[in-house]
Amino acid sequence: QPCPYPMAPPNGHVSPVQAKYILKDSFSIFCETGYELLQGHLPLKSFTAVCQKDGSWDRPMPACSIVDCGPPDDLPSGRVEYITGPGVTTYKAVIQYSCEETFYTMKVNDGKYVCEADGFWTSSKGEKSLPVCEPVCGLSARTTGGRIYGGQKAKPGDFPWQVLILGGTTAAGALLYDNWVLTAAHAVYEQKHDASALDIRMGTLKRLSPHYTQAWSEAVFIHEGYTHDAGFDNDIALIKLNNKVVINSNITPICLPRKEAESFMRTDDIGTASGWGLTQRGFLARNLMYVDIPIVDHQKCTAAYEKPPYPRGSVTANMLCAGLESGGKDSCRGDSGGALVFLDSETERWFVGGIVSWGSMNCGEAGQYGVYTKVINYIPWIENIISDF
């Protein structure tokens, strides 16, 4: 006996169309673009029913339901706006992602997504993944004056990339992006196999303040060319945080130097070092301090560290020096790992040019200079670590 004539569901059609359907005949259902086969909540790629000997179809008719891309995923540090209408997530609906202003900027695309027939929110470039809200780097409440004045107390927002590293000796670092800290290898060498021992604090000016943003380390990456207790060449390390930190006026990453950055780091150009290291009084600073210091000619610095007790070749091409010939302005113990920063006058953003590494036993000594890891030499290394992990 023939099976009942199959009535196509709304927004679908039957194929093949026959006058009647008898034993072993079959039909398939095809949905219009933007509609999908559903049996209840379960999606089907295809649907074919077969006429059975009792004159019934072997399965019930599915629905051709409008494709629903579902609520769009939340964008970390951003928001989503429904353009087509409040809560509309069906075929051809449009949404617009945007990032939290001032502190984040959108990467990858313009943030406009359309619900396509395959059921995925898709950007105008064809991407199905979310855009990225990347922290804006190098923002500071401070603008450089270009002249030297040192031993100043930092004010809120002056050095929002400043990180305090505890868990061994007191050291410093600088926030990169929202989940990495750039520091000196010697400052975290002892914790390289016990990253969780590092107590990382940011968003505070006072070293002993109970008010700070706590971060914990997931992994420590020490440059493979660094040899502990054998000089300070390649004195650079990265700490991966186990969570992203929320960026605000008091916690902002430092920029990495652009290729053109060397033009802002010539001899006598002013960099700024900040930290809670030893002050002239010989104690760790309670308040974050900073000093503006000029870059020193590399040959002059090399010569200053050629005589005993320093071994020949102490200053390498991976280092830069900064300070005054007359002394008095320097970074010191406890500042290790912190950033020596420069203002990129073209982008108007601060970038890290150096990492506080080493210097004379007597900080700020005349004729001696602070020695910093030259960050621009390590951009490929930094980028590789960050992209791989």
Partner: antibody, heavy 115, light 107 residues
Framework: EVQLQESGPGLVKPSQTLSLTCTVS?????????WNWIRQPPGKGLEWIGY???????SYNPSLKSRVTISVDTSKNQFSLKLSSVTAADTAVYYC????????WGQGTTVTVSS | DIQMTQSPSSLSASVGDRVTITCKAS??????VAWYQQKPGKVPKALIY???YRYSGVPSRFSGSGSGTDFTLTISSLQPEDVATYYC?????????FGQGTKLEIK
């Protein structure tokens, strides 16, 4: 005939992430259907966790959504479950299955959450 | 979430008896209901889909009926191998939900 086989650690510590994989043989995961994860706590009933469809779209149980990720690796013909921040209440037999017009279930894998 | 309430929660019947298990949905689920049989220590096995369609290989003594909110699984002549827990399930909307189960024993 399609066969499904779950694999993954039988013991997970509280607060950690449970990770299971379902390997599909005898058919392609991208050919059709919704590929589901279902669990059954000891001595209790069945609970649907979620599915990933032939096209890669996911649907999750709202009660677990904040902790669940289901993904697919079509090159290996596998789909996977990740359940984060587990507690003792997540101790169960976990099944992968195809529901509706086909009825294929894995044998189930017991996951115990304990320190 | 749609609640699927099964009754009875357990029952005891004799071989050859006609056994009926009911399932009530808390809201309309059309005919998007399946029935499963689970024997102790075993994987659930589907018997019925779309309320009344029997899976191939399932004995004809198993049948399903209903639509909307009320559904029934009937075993026309109970066999010893039918001892199991039976679950109804709706797949009409997210989340897919199961009944709490009906444990069937032989007298």
């Amino acid at each position: 005939e399609v066969q499904l086989q779950e694999s993954g650690p039988g013991l997970v510590k509280p607060s950690q992430t449970l990770s299971l994989t379902c390997t599909v043989s005898g058919g392609s995961i991208s050919s059709d259907y919704a590929w589901n994860w279902i669990r059954q706590p000891p001595g209790k009933g069945l609970e649907w966790i979620g599915y990933i469809s032939y096209s890669g779209r996911t649907s999750y149980n709202p009660s677990l959504k904040s902790r669940v990720t289901i993904s697919v690796d079509t090159s290996k013909n596998q789909f996977s479950l990740k359940l984060s921040s587990v507690t003792a209440a997540d101790t169960a037999v976990y099944y992968c299955a195809v529901l509706y017009a086909l009825d294929y279930w894995g044998q189930g894998t017991t996951v115990t959450v304990s320190s | 979430d749609i609640q699927m309430t099964q009754s009875p929660s357990s029952l005891s019947a004799s071989v050859g008896d006609r056994v009926t298990i009911t399932c009530k949905a808390s809201q309309n689920v059309d005919t998007n209901v399946a029935w499963y049989q689970q024997k102790p220590g075993k994987v659930p096995k589907a018997l019925i889909y779309s309320a009344s369609y029997r899976y191939s290989g399932v004995p004809s003594r198993f049948s399903g009926s209903g639509s909307g909110t009320d559904f029934t699984l009937t075993i026309s002549s109970l066999q010893p191998e039918d001892v199991a827990t039976y679950y109804c399930q709706q797949y009409n909307s997210n989340p897919l939900t199961f009944g709490q189960g009906t444990k069937l024993e032989i007298k």
